[in-house]
């Protein structure tokens, strides 16, 4: 069974702590080396107006998931719990198409970084998605921010088109994902 959400909300940049968009085709291009180049255009629709959708109001639909770009600052763990409270999980990137979609969304917020659902206990242990699945670097590389002062960046965020490791305690925005089945 599929939940159908009906929404009459407008399309603001920031509403109730969430970054909203109606359609992402008009984003400025990222200035850094982009992950978008080999990716097909997105098919994103935000649940606005009176329509039937498998996603709650203000979530963005792309393929078989709903996405919420939270604009409240939180640690990685706090962001994870925030997503859970909304019946979702921190973003898990499954394909290059999905990666391209996400890059296109966050590129409109070049000053902000967004936690995704990738972490590890320490540097000797491999990265793990929140659902327990393995991380494959074939999909994307994680650029390290490790320094002598901060040697243990064990959580992952995306900034424009680059994915970085980062200290899990640093407050940041986040991306929640809710998968649905048609």
């Amino acid at each position: 069974t599929m939940a159908i959400w009906r929404s009459n909300s407008g399309s603001n940049t920031l509403e109730n702590g969430y970054f909203l968009s109606r359609n992402k085709e008009n984003h400025s291009q990222p200035t850094q080396s982009s992950l978008e180049d080999s990716v097909t255009p997105t098919k994103a629709v935000k649940t606005t107006g009176v329509l039937s959708s498998p996603c709650p109001p203000n979530w963005i639909i792309y393929e078989k998931s709903c996405y919420l770009f939270s604009m409240s600052l939180n640690s990685w763990d706090g962001s994870k719990r925030q997503c859970w409270q909304l019946g979702s999980n921190l973003l898990k990137i499954d394909s290059s198409n999905e990666l391209g979609f996400i890059v296109k969304q966050v590129s409109s917020q070049p000053d902000n970084s967004f936690w995704i659902g990738l972490s590890r206990p320490q540097t000797e242990v491999p990265w793990l998605w929140e659902d327990g699945s393995t991380f494959s670097s074939n999909l994307f590389q994680i650029r390290t921010t490790a320094t002598q002062e901060n040697p243990s960046p064990n959580c992952v965020w995306i900034h424009v088109s680059v994915i970085y490791d980062q200290l899990c305690s640093v407050p940041s925005y986040s991306i929640c994902e809710k998968k649905f089945s048609m």
Partner: antibody, heavy 118, light 107 residues
Framework: QVQLVQSGAEVKKPGASVKVSCKSS????????IHWVRQAPGQGLEWMGW????????NYAQKFQGRITMTRDTSISTAYLELSRLRSDDTAVFYC???????????WGQGTLVTVSS | DIQMTQSPSSVSASVGDRVTITCRAS??????LAWYQQKPGKAPKLLIY???SLQSGVPSRFSGSGSGTDFTLTISSLQPEDFATYYC?????????FGPGTKVDIE
């Protein structure tokens, strides 16, 4: 639903090898680590290592280095544990388990009893 | 290797009792800790992961707390099916290690 089904009980002599299989179903086999855990009679749980079914990469507990081999056959969604140079104190139930969140073991096989006796 | 200790090693309790089991790591493991329940002749069952997250399908009378080196599993109101052995497990560093177990039996 996720299921892990292991091969049947084995009786081996000291010095021999044993190979236990673990067939997965109900999920994408290559997406999750498979761990192997053993439990001697009346004792606690002991992690032996894992295999990444996608890459074949393994990580073994130091205690078993040199006589443990974990492999997989992705075409039949099956992981294998081979333990060589068996000793009587290797008598145990061997479990495979699928990785879950925070490196926990969310799904377990039914266990395979391996008895090492002369 | 990180050593995990549990206390008590066994506890006798009655249906309806609140039962608390503690687990201590020999070094800090953040929240990389899981709890399992095992009944005789059966495989372990995951109850809690990430120190406090309840595994899907596990009754809400089970809860986990703690971070760093000290962790707690609480059964708020013991049910007949809860008599079993409980293990904690750290997933902070290799090799992953388990506590020795706490047996909960009928008083």
């Amino acid at each position: 639903q996720v299921q892990l089904v292991q091969s049947g009980a084995e009786v081996k002599k000291p010095g021999a090898s044993v190979k236990v299989s673990c067939k997965s179903s109900g999920y994408t086999f290559t997406d999750y680590y498979i761990h192997w855990v053993r439990q001697a009679p009346g004792q606690g749980l002991e992690w032996m290592g894992w295999i990444n079914p996608n890459s074949g990469d393994t990580n073994y507990a130091q205690k078993f280095q040199g006589r443990i081999t974990m492999t997989r056959d992705t075409s039949i969604s099956t992981a294998y544990l081979e333990l060589s140079r068996l000793r009587s104190d290797d008598t145990a139930v061997f479990y495979c388990a699928r990785n879950s969140g925070s490196y926990s073991f969310g799904y377990w096989g039914q266990g395979t009893l391996v008895t090492v006796s002369s | 290797d990180i050593q995990m200790t549990q206390s008590p090693s066994s506890v006798s309790a009655s249906v309806g009792d609140r039962v608390t089991i503690t687990c201590r790591a020999s070094q800090g493991i953040s929240s990389w800790l899981a709890w399992y329940q095992q009944k005789p002749g059966k495989a372990p069952k995951l109850l809690i992961y990430g120190a406090s997250s309840l595994q899907s399908g596990v009754p809400s009378r089970f809860s986990g707390s703690g971070s760093g080196t000290d962790f707690t599993l609480t059964i708020s109101s013991l049910q007949p099916e809860d008599f079993a052995t409980y293990y904690c497990q750290q997933a902070y560093s290799f090799p992953f290690t388990f506590g020795p177990g706490t047996k909960v039996d009928i008083e």
